[in-house]
Interface confidence: low
Amino acid sequence: KSPIFGPEEVNSVEGNSVSITCYYPPTSVNRHTRKYWCRQGARGGCITLISSEGYVSSKYAGRANLTNFPENGTFVVNIAQLSQDDSGRYKCGLGINSRGLSFDVSLEVSQGPGLLNDTKVYTVDLGRTVTINCPFKTENAQKRKSLYKQIGLYPVLVIDSSGYVNPNYTGRIRLDIQGTGQLLFSVVINQLRLSDAGQYLCQAGDDSNSNKKNADLQVLKPEPELVYEDLRGSVTFHCALGPEVANVAKFLCRQSSGENCDVVVNTLGKRAPAFEGRILLNPQDKDGSFSVVITGLRKEDAGRYLCGAHSDGQLQEGSPIQAWQLFVNEESTIPRSPTVVKGVAGGSVAVLCPYNRKESKSIKYWCLWEGAQNGRCPLLVDSEGWVKAQYEGRLSLLEEPGNGTFTVILNQLTSRDAGFYWCLTNGDTLWRTTVEIKIIEGEPNLKVPGNVTAVLGETLKVPCHFPCKFSSYEKYWCKWNNTGCQALPSQDEGPSKAFVNCDENSRLVSLTLNLVTRADEGWYWCGVKQGHFYGETAAVYVAVEERKAAGSRDVSLAKADAAPDEKVLDSGFREIENKAIQDPRLFAEEKAVADTRDQADGSRASVDSGSSEEQGGSSR
């Protein structure tokens, strides 16, 4: 499919001008290659009329130009002094005319309306209001006032001062007679329809002395604004319908076959299932304007969109509307990233978020999409050290791997974490991407004790158990804070108060805190990574308390005395300890038990490797 995009239809009137914008992917090659506008012949060729290399056909001499805007990825063809001979099928394109890097444009130039003398022309947008003013002389002040519409050869009464209203105008028309001082009556028509267009005649009086005034009403269907966005990117539709509909329900719909317009989202709470998790309707301003953001653009999102206002929250005849033609460029600069990430309850996910690599200094954000009402996306974390309070200790945004991708890690997962999340920055708003987190059945791969209490001045070791499949990964412990998770040095990196030791045989990576102080209290994460790509993490909170007086019983030991069949959920190791109390031989078999479990984990993970659009908790 050609990535070139422009207006499918351009309509104008003889003598007028048109300006046609064509969009192209702004790659280095495209920015500098030839741009052209050609007319399609009956036999399939396309004859160049104007190009960016300076050529102008004699047909266009002195009345056309082509301007390239490489920074926007657009070029504009302006044609003046239009005649009906200019009607036809054209192409705007890049490179060679026959190469197919082009877009078909139909230009229709019509004759200007043949109007009677003294005809007032009213040009009004579809769905809006028109006021037709009708002057009269004093002798007709007390006589019947009326408005007719010319239908074919015959005038048809629309409204009159005796109270008649044509059924086609019921509920949306009124006749106002000004105060005695002004010799004028006016007819106000609301919620204009395309069928309202035509020639009108207003009349005061019915005899040969009546006053008459001709009016020509032109109802304009809004020209769609062309919107060119990248696949997987984001689009924002800004809809300003005017203060007169400020209190009317708003909608955005997508035109399907014919005149149907399927609601995408509206202010009455309706949302199309295809847009779940990737759409926000920003609440409207006092003047009735609002905007709709759609992320994670798909090929099938391309098409014509209308926003409007109607009490039903959907398109009806007479709704004021605004239109867009969305083209989704498949030659996207936005890299593929998983749209679904799976994690298990108690486990973690690492989400890769793309951003525009030209904006490496931009602030990165992650928010949780909420579908209630019109949708919103409250921030959970940013790259400047802010984390929403409820997520402290279990959420971190990392600038790694960098170069167009940042990482978000969320652990201690529960079913409540399932949902849609958005990656965004304070820079290029087109680079908003959506990922869905799904919570699936399974056990976390990394196991740490549930609660750890350290004693001031003593040494603490905290184990983290990992399965065979992570043997080749780098293991680490880090101390969580708002700005990230600061990795603690491993034992062989030299003496340190806090360090990490890994025993590959028992597959334990342990955190050691020497001479515990109050400053050591907090969240610690055990994790695995490959280079700058983060995998699973497990979190443990280390509480610090005073040394107890001699003879007082340590509550943490009491927990270990749980009955053998009791499932203590705060530790992956506790289950093994309890079995050992029951049967001392299990101490010797502890490693074997762990091995069996790990192999099961490994085989399960290999089955659910996920599609190219999905990513497991280990996020590669």
Partner: nanobody, 125 residues
Framework: QVQLVESGGGLVQAGDSLRLSCAAS??????????MGWFRQAPGKEREFVAS????????YYADSVKGRFTVTRDNAKNTVTLRMNSLKPADTAVYYC????????????????WGQGTLVTVSS
């Protein structure tokens, strides 16, 4: 464009209270999609962060110098954000500015996109 107009400034005695309001208007997205912040600038000094509040009003953040004395709230129905200042000190004398941001960030580096003109608060000893 978002327009912000502060009000409520004036001359008060040390130890008194004062309430500043900021009214938002404009044609862009609605008020309840913006995070709001308060800053102040004392004569001859740089503008400094005072407090911030997210769009829902659920998250607030304060500069250490005002913590416990100032409270920031918002009323999305009325498009206003309020800074309640108690136990005022002469050191609180400054022009107070209201700011709006398209995103909320707790901390003193509030990412303001729009600013008001300011309202003067003078605390005499």
């Amino acid at each position: 464009q978002v327009q912000l107009v502060e009000s409520g400034g004036g001359l008060v005695q040390a130890g008194d209270s004062l309430r500043l309001s900021c009214a938002a208007s404009g044609r862009t997205l609605s008020f309840d999609t913006y995070a709001m912040g308060w800053f102040r600038q004392a004569p001859g000094k740089e503008r400094e962060f005072v407090a911030s509040i997210d769009w829902s009003g659920g998250t607030t953040y304060y500069a250490d110098s005002v913590k416990g004395r100032f409270t920031v709230t918002r009323d999305n129905a009325k498009n206003t954000v309020t800074l309640r200042m108690n136990s005022l000190k002469p050191a609180d004398t400054a022009v107070y500015y209201c700011a709006a941001a398209q995103y909320y960030r707790s901390g003193t580096s509030f990412p303001a996109n729009y600013w008001g003109q300011g309202t003067l608060v003078t605390v005499s000893s």
